[in-house]
């Protein structure tokens, strides 16, 4: 199905527009700001959403320690240029002719240059560290309840198969969640872990971008997980190419 | 669509046991949550416990020993055991699903079962 | 245990006048990182289950009618109902799930 055919709504993205206009008067539902068609039966591209953001209006175990080559999104919201399939464009450039390159997460790794910079490829993101600290509970979750509590939730609410939930990593506050998905395993169909690292980050924020009530209630075994900080590194296949000075900033 | 059918005897003499069953449709039991809740005739509302999809149980502390609450996943059924009934454990026991993870909300309940303990 | 208070327990209207109900908690429900409170509305009509209203104090369900309205934060919450209607005579409970859950001693909407 593409949309909630009952109310011709999009449940995975509420940033659409839809009308029964499709074949056969079928509900259809277009991305906020690029005006394409997005399929409502699995998560809308990461580009496609930050698109749509911009022109809404405005309102024993141990932790794994991020490689060297590992990027933080530091450079905050922007309008991105989405290919015909949704895809960050390799070569993002703003209104001031400034460009740069960006990962298929769409996080810039490369240094800022003008229109002469030249991205050959759209690099992948294949694997992101998701650290997030929990607010103080009365004891620590149980390990393996958490895992699977979360494991669920990448299965079930952000349709991720669970071949590319890593790891699930907890150290008393701190829970991180390792999605791994290189482009030779994302077949067909495959929901990419970008997208679903977004989804969550957006969840976690109290800004789903599900359709309904706007809220993601995370339990394990009943007991409220609220997440008082979020740190997503992205591990490119790749290594980033920024200059010496940024390196030494 | 979803539904949530109870079934369960209507008259327990006091010092048994209760037993109702909640079957469920139009959704999994492993992907949502089963609430049980009560409410004494012309009071209010009591909850008593919860099954979670992944299969761990809380119960209303001051019910705790008196409650178990079971699940059978290949048949979408949920059960309430209640021992040691007492006279004023009579009323209305409501099955209701909470919504995952967009909230623990009740947004579904079942029809009732009407408990006499005489 | 969060304990829930609601008030008044009772109250009589005429159609068309515009009601608020209370309903208070022993703690905070409120979540800081989502900022959404963990708070529910329920109506419940005589001889049927209880029905959702509102969810996370002041996300309307659907289909509910606008002049139904939640708001507040922290402990304090109100329901409003802004032009009583006469299908609207029922209880109302409020129901916190910030600590597994309680639901208030309910307010009951009769006309006067």
């Known amino acids: 199905h593409t949309a909630a055919q009952d109310n011709c709504t999009c449940p995975t993205n509420k940033m659409t527009v839809c009308s029964p206009d499709g074949p056969g008067g079928r509900c259809q539902c277009r991305a906020l700001g690029s005006g394409m068609a997005v399929d409502c039966s699995t998560l809308t591209s990461k580009c496609l959403l930050l698109k749509a953001r911009m022109s809404a209006p405005k309102n024993a175990r141990t932790l794994v320690r991020p490689s060297e080559h590992a990027l933080v999104d530091n450079d905050g919201l922007y309008d991105p240029d989405c290919d015909p399939e949704g895809r960050f464009k390799a070569r993002q450039c703003n209104q001031t002719s400034v460009c740069w390159c960006v990962n298929s997460v769409g996080v810039r790794r490369t240094d800022k240059g003008d229109l002469s910079l030249r991205c050959d490829e759209l690099v992948r993101t294949h694997h992101i560290l998701i650290d997030l600290r929990h607010r103080p509970t009365a004891g620590a979750f149980n390990h393996s309840d958490l895992d699977a509590e979360l494991r669920r939730l990448f299965r079930e609410r952000y349709r991720l198969h669970p071949k590319f939930v890593a790891a699930v990593h907890y150290e008393q506050p701190t829970i991180q969640i390792e999605l791994r998905q290189n482009t030779s395993q994302k077949a067909a169909g495959d929901v990419d872990i970008g997208d679903a690292a977004y989804y969550f980050e957006r969840d976690i924020k109290g800004e789903s971008l599900f359709q309904g009530r706007g809220g993601l209630d995370l339990r394990v075994r009943g007991e409220p997980l609220q997440v008082e900080r979020t740190l997503i590194y992205y591990l490119d296949e790749i290594p980033p190419k920024f200059s010496m000075k940024r390196l030494t900033a | 669509q979803v539904q949530l059918k109870q079934s369960g005897p209507g008259l327990v003499a006091p010092s048994q046991s209760l037993s109702i069953t909640c079957t469920v449709s139009g959704f999994s039991l492993t992907s949502y949550g089963v609430n049980w809740i009560r409410q004494p005739p012309g009071k209010g509302l009591e909850w008593l416990g919860v099954?979670?999809?992944?299969?761990?149980?809380n119960y209303n502390s001051a019910l705790m020993s008196r409650l178990s609450i079971s699940k059978d996943n290949s048949k979408s059924q949920v059960f309430l055991k209640m021992n040691s009934l007492q006279t004023d454990d009579t009323g209305m026991y409501y099955c209701a699903r909470d919504e995952n993870w967009d909230g623990a909300w009740f947004a579904y309940w079942g029809q009732g079962t009407l408990v006499t303990v005489s | 245990d969060i304990q829930m208070t609601q008030s008044p327990s009772s109250l009589a209207v005429s159609a068309g006048e515009k009601v608020t109900m209370s309903c208070k908690s022993s703690?905070?429900?409120?979540?800081?990182?989502?900022?959404?409170?963990?708070l529910a509305w329920y109506q419940q009509k005589p001889g049927q289950s209880p029905k959702l209203l509102i969810s996370w104090a002041s996300s309307r369900e659907s289909g509910v009618p606008d002049r139904f309205t939640g708001s507040g934060s922290g402990t304090d919450f109100t329901l409003t109902i802004s032009s009583v209607q006469a299908e609207d005579l029922a209880v109302y409970y409020c129901k916190q799930s910030y600590n597994l859950f309680t639901f208030g001693g309910g307010t009951k909407l009769e006309l006067k």
């Open positions: 099954m979670w999809a992944g299969g761990s149980t």
């Open positions: 703690q905070s429900l409120l979540n800081s990182g989502t900022r959404k409170n963990y």
